[in-house]
Interface confidence: low
Amino acid sequence: GSTVPPMVNVTRSEASEGNITVTCRASSFYPRNIILTWRQDGVSLSHDTQQWGDVLPDGNGTYQTWVATRICRGEEQRFTCYMEHSGNHSTHPVPSGNSHHHHHHHH
């Protein structure tokens, strides 16, 4: 099939005191090969500080996956989710408040 760019969604949730978990979800993309990783100060975090979900079919002939990491509250502006798919790449910041999230479709 033709290339379908991912929808990228960054959310945050409370973790332990002083920490938050930030999750970056990529959905509705094809083909399934994708790079999704958290960066701090513009450089990818090491694998041992991130958790990845499997790349799974979402029932529409496309795929979905996620990556999460735990960070200190107040340090959000240092972190971005980096996505690379079919030769295109994009970076997505952490939203500023608990109830906000960012949705971006990339063409």
Partner: antibody, heavy 118, light 108 residues
Framework: EVQLVQSGAEVKKPGASVKVSCKAS????????IYWVRQAPGQGLEWIGY????????IYNQQFKDRVTITADTSTSTAYLELSSLRSEDTAVYYC???????????WGQGTLVTVSS | EIVLTQSPATLSLSPGERATLSCSAS???????LHWYQQKPGQAPRLLIY???NLASGIPARFSGSGSGTDFTLTISSLEPEDFAVYYC?????????FGQGTKVEIK
Amino acid sequence: EVQLVQSGAEVKKPGASVKVSCKASGYAFTSNNIYWVRQAPGQGLEWIGYIDPYIGRIIYNQQFKDRVTITADTSTSTAYLELSSLRSEDTAVYYCSRSGERSNFDYWGQGTLVTVSS
Amino acid sequence: EIVLTQSPATLSLSPGERATLSCSASSSISSNYLHWYQQKPGQAPRLLIYRTSNLASGIPARFSGSGSGTDFTLTISSLEPEDFAVYYCQQGGSLPLTFGQGTKVEIK
């Protein structure tokens, strides 16, 4: 080979502004942040701020926030530091540096001496 | 702000001797975020050790780093003439990014 080449020395009067450039080569400019650091004569290193050239995000050391502007031009792989309302204590060597693993400074420019004198 | 205090301010040693430089943080730092730099007169600093104990590219094995929490150490096992310089520690764990005030290693 990664290189950061900075603009030449500047002499400015108090109250003036200065803009220092840092041209990057040897790597994909948008894949790393550019940090700015200064070092007053005989003193230690002081982090000023950084820019993520890919999304244009800028983070400043609060100490410098009111007088510093950091920008980047991705078309020329060049980052800029502008410091306004200069005073004598701003006399220093200003360095640009590339972000490395875990927020270190892995490559440095040669430095730009800014002298503020009446 | 995390304050890094380096000691001693000056270390006077002879070539071939062992140098031990300390960096103490005002609050705990993950060892992943503590780095060391070397600076010679008239030159930019250069990355020496990253993530507490990893040698940067091209750095000789006589340099080593260790530590955790608030106390970190840079060791030069046997000083060469080119090692006489100023050494800075730096933390990247929280903003603002900060450096120690430096330790000067001079020829005795």
